[in-house]
Interface confidence: low
């Protein structure tokens, strides 16, 4: 059962796992949610009746029954983890805490103009978990405007104390606001020989990399595969760090793989969700339950639905046994990973999917697309929407992309002459325009947010957000697309598609069925040569065939240029402008979304 409200002046008795320090009960709930075992917590607020050494303590708790006895205690605030909830969860915490000093290892001290600048510095520093900033009213002259960057083993403060005229806050890496590079490569036959901060068991290097990503101190990792010569180290995932933030030594070793934390790209790739099955593999751990199940998929569902289950092993039924049902072993451990991994015993193992909601919805795999052909099939581009205007009569105006459950990203130039959001309708999950009838459900638009530097498409800033009046329930036919990571600026996308209901040639009409075309990206240098009369800026991205023939056209504007990278689709461009349609040596020009990620996040995450 999902319980989101906090219980004031209430303490849960017993079940303690560990104590951490958090600046608020709200953040204590987030820490509990991300902890592999925590189901409940008790936070102690500052209060004259409480011992100051206990202020800001966040006690993480577990219980077999998923609840604990309640005791009245002033200044105690208790609650439940969001593990039991189905809604999307985020570790992003933009709050600034006034007059609080969050203690940790002060590894960097510098002057900053403001708390915001200090927070940005922390966000862009690979080691920083949180910061404390002494304001210009701070009593000690030599400490005024000092920004202290801090880290700890747990990522949370080692203590929090009251201190006048300082403010503290957390790194915004988990808000997708870091400019740090996003290095997704996994290096085969490589060992990073730096200090280990932790080690866990993992079935493959991808899971190891994801564990590294959400471990607060891990910057890179080395994984020993099941073919690693030293038996005791097989399937071992070593979580590592270094002072420089990069591996100091790389050693060539067969059957080992190494890679980096994906912290700065975690909003656009799955980090918590280990959805694969591992055949002929047994995960060992504390047994929670043994249940009969028809298949390993059914076993995974059982694990996902059992809030304390972290991973499972399924042993298929022996012929004619137990109505063809196998045994499903639901398991857990102190850190959420198997205590040992064994091969060759016939089991099929995997992880709970409960944690998938901690990843961005946009990373969910969508059904395979039909390659070739120009007409799309249902569910092929579930982020694509058709934006209609109802004035003077209803018709398709532009395309757009779902990027959040209340947000559509589109082009600014679509709204020239649109005086009010009231005349707009957003239709999602649509394949054919002819499906749209008077009674077809749509999303009303609450607000049109146009980039304030937009003048006309050709001069850039051709980007706009639509805030919907109601939220989109994600399904197979309507779900968001990931924004590109700022750390992915150097990625070369090779699988890019433009979609829309627009014209198929310059003299044409709106298409009934959503059209798609695979289009190669063109360098800005090459694009500039083709548009000598225009300035192709780094905030634009171009795509098209040299010989022409495939392109976006009228009516496609605002729609996505979607590129697949590492199995995840990213919204790389917004259809903006071009000379004619599909003309030879005239690529289409798109708004370069990666350059507007800050703007998008600022507008969509505004309180």
């Amino acid at each position: 059962e999902c319980v989101t409200q906090l219980l004031k002046d209430t303490c849960f008795e017993g079940g303690d796992i560990t104590t951490v320090f958090t600046p608020s009960a709200k953040y204590c709930q987030v820490v509990c949610t991300y902890h592999p075992r925590c189901l409940l917590f008790t936070f102690t607020a500052e209060s004259p009746s409480e011992d100051p050494t206990r202020w800001f303590t966040c006690v993480l708790k577990d219980s077999v029954t998923e609840t604990l006895p309640r005791v009245n205690r002033t200044a105690a605030i208790s609650g439940y983890s969001f593990k039991q909830c189905s809604h999307q969860i985020s570790a992003c915490n933009k709050d600034i805490y006034v007059d609080l000093d969050m203690k940790g290892i002060n590894y960097n001290s510098s002057v900053a103009k403001s708390a915001q600048e200090c927070q940005e510095r922390c966000t862009d520093d690979v080691h920083c978990h949180f910061f404390t900033y002494a304001t210009r009213q701070f009593p000690s002259l030599e400490h005024r405007n000092i920004c202290l960057l801090k880290h700890t083993q747990t990522g949370t403060p080692t203590r929090i104390t009251k201190l006048d005229k300082v403010v503290s806050g957390f790194s915004l890496k988990s808000c997708a606001l870091s400019n740090l590079a996003c290095i997704r490569d996994i290096f085969p036959n490589t060992v990073f020989a730096d200090s280990n901060i932790d080690s866990v068991m993992a079935p493959d290097a991808f899971v190891c990399g994801r564990i590294c990503t959400h471990h607060p101190g891990c910057l890179f990792f080395t994984f020993f595969s099941q073919e690693w010569p030293k038996e005791s180290q097989r399937n071992l995932c070593l979580l590592k760090t270094s002072e420089s933030g990069l591996p100091s030594t790389r050693i060539k070793k067969s059957k080992a793989l190494s890679g980096f934390s994906l912290q700065s790209c975690r909003h656009s790739i799955p980090v918590f969700c280990h959805s694969s099955f591992y055949h002929d593999t047994d995960f060992l751990g504390e047994e929670l339950d043994i249940v009969a199940a028809k298949s390993h998929e059914a076993c995974q569902k059982l694990c996902t639905n059992a809030v304390r289950c972290q991973f499972f092993t399924y042993t298929p039924a022996q012929a004619s046994c137990n109505e063809g049902k196998g045994k499903c072993y639901l398991k857990l451990s102190s850190n959420g990973s198997p205590t040992k991994i064994l091969h060759g015993r016939g089991g099929i193992s995997g992880y709970t999917l409960r944690l998938c909601k901690m990843d961005n919805e946009c990373t969910t795999k969508i059904k395979p697309r039909i390659v070739g052909g120009t007409a799309s099939v249902r569910g092929e581009w579930p982020w694509q929407v058709t934006l209609h205007t109802t004035s003077p009569t209803q018709r398709h105006l532009c395309g757009g992309s779902i990027i959040g459950n209340q947000w559509i990203l589109t082009a600014a130039h679509c709204f020239y002459g649109v005086e009010s959001p009231k005349i707009l309708r957003v239709y999602s999950g649509i394949l054919n325009q002819s499906e749209i009838k008077e009674d077809t459900s749509f999303f009303g638009v609450q607000e049109i947010i146009i980039h304030d530097q937009y003048k006309m498409a050709e001069s850039g800033y051709d980007i706009a957000l639509l805030k919907l009046e109601t939220t989109v329930n994600y399904t197979d036919s309507q779900r968001p697309i990931c924004l590109p990571s700022k750390g992915d600026r150097n990625v070369i996308y090779t699988d890019c598609w433009v979609t829309g209901w627009g014209y198929r040639k310059l003299r044409d009409k709106i298409q009934n069925t959503l059209q798609k075309a695979k289009i190669p990206l063109v360098t800005n240098e090459e694009c500039q040569k083709r548009y000598r009369g225009h300035k192709i800026t780094h905030k634009m991205i171009c795509a098209g065939y040299r010989e022409g023939g495939k392109d976006a056209c009228k009516g496609d504007s605002g729609g996505p240029l979607s590129c697949k990278h590492n199995e995840v689709w990213h919204l790389v461009g917004i259809t903006s402008w071009g000379e004619g349609c599909a003309q030879r040596e005239r690529p289409g020009v798109y708004t370069n979304v990666v350059e507007y990620v800050d703007w998008i996040l600022e507008k969509t995450q505004a309180v």
Partner: nanobody, 123 residues
């Protein structure tokens, strides 16, 4: 096949009025933009009036004298021309498109054009 057919042209004395009509056929959806352009002998074609998503835009030379209107149900666009002057003499063309405004109301971005109807204003 999309077709635009103008009608209503003719000869008129200066100060007189005419109403031009344009019927669009062969198109399932309403056009986002419909407009009137004109071309006098030996001159370049120029924009007269445009109706875009219900909002109207006029060339400075016709403001206050000409009125553009639209009947979406019939996919028709009209141009009511009052206080006509001899310099209004030209071939008048109807244009339509799913136009996204590209910085100029009277650019050459319209895909569909009619054959034109002649308007002659004598002094």
């Amino acid at each position: 096949q999309v077709q635009l057919q103008e009608s209503g042209g003719g000869s008129v004395q200066a100060g007189g009025s005419l109403r031009l009509s344009c019927a669009a056929s062969g198109y399932t959806y309403s056009f986002n933009s419909m407009g009137w352009f004109r071309q006098a002998p030996g001159k370049e074609r120029e924009g007269v009036a445009v109706i875009y998503l219900g909002s109207t835009h006029y060339a400075d030379s016709v403001k206050g004298r000409f009125t553009i209107s639209q009947d979406n149900a019939k996919n028709m666009v009209y141009l009511q021309m009052n206080s006509l002057k001899p310099e209004d003499t030209a071939m008048y063309y109807c244009a339509a498109d799913l136009l996204e405004y590209d910085g100029t109301w009277f650019g050459s971005t319209y895909n569909y054009w009619g054959q034109g109807t002649q308007v002659t204003v004598s002094s």
